[in-house]
Structure formats: structure tokens, C-alpha cells
């Protein structure tokens, strides 16, 4: 049997026998275009494709539509994988989304959505989520029904303001909504009463900016 040489996600890589967390090359569905991603092969059985990570503020997340579309940062540290890749990937199969959060007091929490996909660019990469479980709040901190993605140069939110400019970062802003994991990074002791920070309302409330976040996806049938 011929070995698979291209992989669409980290679950395929895991199932091929490569079970060490790290950077791997993925291939766009129905294409030869490649993208580098961090694969988490340890959490909850492994096979997770990391689509977002924040940990130290080393990467500027106040980026353009094009940058959020194509991705930016380093998969070994802070990065955004790219809306176009995630949209294409999650449009082909059913994926779950796991969001891991850390606060500055040593606590961790997560939200797990049992179905996640992004619409195409023509629909502003609108987010679709169902089936919330987890410890980071009983109510979804990503507005339901899902919102369009907005950036500093592409305002698609429902607010009379421009949420991306007011709150910083590209996100699925509502008006502006209960979360923004791509907000301004604030260090410890400067992370409260910061309304443009890294927000997950139904875990930490208003004005609390988180220490670290990871968004990762995996096929539902993994």
C-alpha cells in the first residue's frame, strides 16, 4: 500500500503514525497549495489542527482582511492559520472546534463545539457553531447565530461602531459580542478593565484579558 504523502489536516497525519506534536505541512483540499500548521497530538487523543494560538503578545493581531485570510505568525508560537484554508477544510467534512483558555491565576477552561465550519469569503467567513459543552461557560461566548468575520479594513459587524477598530483584532464580531480571542495582548497585572483585550465573557466576564488561548479543530469522526 502506497504511503499517503499529502495531508489535509492533523488528524490524517496522526492516523498515518506521526504522533508527535509540532509543525507539519498541510495541503488545501482539492489543490496542491500547502500551508504550515501546528498539530497538537497530545490533547484529548491528538489529531488537532491548531488554527489560532496566543501566549505572550509577540505577534500583532491587528491585521488586514488579506492577512487573516492567508494566515500570519509562527505555528511554533502565536499565529492565525488562515480563514481560507479553514473555510475550505471545514466545508468538506464535519469538524469539531475546541477552544482552550488560560487566565492569569493559573486556571484553565475550554469550550467544545460539536460542529464548526466557516462559510466562504463571499459570506465573509461567517462562523457556524452548534453543540456547546465545556467548562468556559454554559452560554456560547461566540455569538449565536454566527457572525461575519471583520477586520480593521473590512467592517462586517452589526455595530454602529467598527468593532475591529474599537476592540482590536479580526474576529466574528456581533455588536460587538461576548468574545474576541484576537484582541490586544495585556501582560499580568495590566489585564483587567481592558475592553480591547482577549475576551471570553462567559468565563471571565467584562474587561478581563486572558493569558493564553488555543483554537483547534478535528474531524468529528476522529
Amino acid at each position: 500500500k502506497e504511503e499517503q504523502t499529502t495531508f489535509r489536516d492533523c488528524a490524517e497525519i496522526f492516523k498515518s503514525g506521526l504522533t508527535t506534536s509540532g509543525i507539519y505541512t498541510l495541503t488545501f483540499p482539492n489543490s496542491t497549495e500547502e500551508i504550515k500548521a501546528y498539530c497538537d497530538m497530545d490533547v484529548g487523543g491528538g489529531g488537532w489542527t491548531v488554527i489560532q494560538h496566543r501566549e505572550d503578545g509577540s505577534v500583532d493581531f491587528q491585521r488586514t482582511w488579506k492577512e487573516y485570510k492567508e494566515g500570519f505568525g509562527s505555528p511554533l508560537g502565536e499565529y492565525w492559520l488562515g480563514n481560507e484554508f479553514v473555510s475550505q477544510l471545514t466545508g468538506q467534512h464535519r469538524y469539531v472546534l475546541k477552544i482552550q483558555l488560560k487566565d492569569w491565576e493559573g486556571n484553565e477552561a475550554h469550550s467544545l463545539y460539536d460542529h464548526f465550519y466557516l462559510a466562504g469569503e463571499e459570506s465573509n467567513y461567517r462562523i457556524h457553531l452548534t453543540g456547546l459543552t465545556g467548562t468556559a461557560g454554559k452560554i456560547s461566548s461566540i455569538s449565536q447565530p454566527g457572525s461575519d468575520f471583520s477586520t480593521k479594513d473590512s467592517d462586517n459587524d452589526k455595530c454602529i461602531c467598527k468593532c475591529s477598530q474599537m476592540l482590536s483584532g479580526g474576529w466574528w464580531f456581533d455588536a460587538c459580542g461576548p468574545s474576541n480571542l484576537n484582541g490586544q495582548y495585556y501582560p499580568q497585572k495590566q489585564n483587567t478593565n481592558k475592553f480591547n483585550g482577549i475576551k471570553w465573557y462567559y468565563w471571565k466576564g467584562s474587561g478581563y484579558s486572558l493569558k493564553a488561548t488555543t483554537m483547534m479543530i478535528r474531524p468529528a469522526d476522529f
Partner: nanobody, 133 residues
């Protein structure tokens, strides 16, 4: 330092009235819409009433319409909640909160969305209201 300080809560018999006050300081009061929220024991926090800083528009959750009245005094940086015809189901801790007026929903649904609690940046510590039967 931002402060919202509620007062006026207490124990009242069903059918009675209370007037809650919320004194704001540390931010430009006229740039913020104000809301009243409440949380009963074992229940989620819910929005009660809202007032717009720009034109005084108000909004009430269905269960208090016709009984509660929200108002504000910009000169005193204070928002009020007049509560009449109180019923035991009104028993809760009442909180006032402030959000930037710019964070309003675009279009005709903005008033109905005015009590989205996650848009409120500043919160008071709350005042207990107990309605006995």
C-alpha cells in the same frame, strides 16, 4: 477609578414600591448607556431596563413593563429605577451597568438588543431587593 454604586434596595411587601439609584464616577457619564440587571438566587443574570445616553430612549424586559421606570440625571451622574407594584418574583440582587453608547446594534433591532449584558463594561456591586408575600 470607575465606580458604580447602587443604593435603595431593601425588604418590601408585595404591591409596594422601591426606588433604586446608581451613582457613577470615573468615566464620562454622557458617553455611556446605562442598564439595570438582576440576578435571583440560582438563576442567570437577566436584563431589566435600559436607557440611552443620547436621546433617553428606554427599554424594558416584558416582565417589568408598566411597573418599572428607568430615568437618569446627567447632572448628578446617576441613573434610577422606580419599581412599583412589586411581586415576589422581583426578588433579586439588582445591578447597574454602563456600556459605551457607540456599542449599539446597527438598524431597527438596536433597542431590543440593548440589554446584551456582555456589552457592558462597568458593573456595580449590586443591591438586594426582597419582596415578601
Amino acid at each position: 477609578e470607575v465606580q458604580l454604586v447602587e443604593s435603595g434596595g431593601g425588604l418590601v411587601q408585595a404591591g409596594g414600591s422601591l426606588r433604586l439609584s446608581c451613582a457613577a464616577s470615573g468615566f464620562d457619564f454622557e458617553d455611556y448607556d446605562m442598564g439595570w440587571f438582576r440576578q435571583a438566587p440560582g438563576k442567570e443574570r437577566e436584563g431589566v431596563s435600559y436607557i440611552s445616553s443620547s436621546d433617553g430612549s428606554t427599554y424594558y424586559t416584558d416582565s417589568v413593563k408598566g411597573r418599572f421606570t428607568i430615568s437618569s440625571d446627567n447632572a448628578k451622574n446617576t441613573v434610577y429605577l422606580q419599581m412599583n407594584s412589586l411581586i415576589p418574583e422581583d426578588t433579586a440582587v439588582y445591578y447597574c451597568a454602563a456600556r459605551p453608547w457607540t456599542r449599539r446594534v446597527y438598524g431597527s433591532s438596536w433597542l431590543a438588543r440593548s440589554l446584551d449584558e456582555y456589552e457592558y463594561d462597568y458593573w456595580g456591586q449590586g443591591t438586594q431587593v426582597t419582596v415578601s408575600s
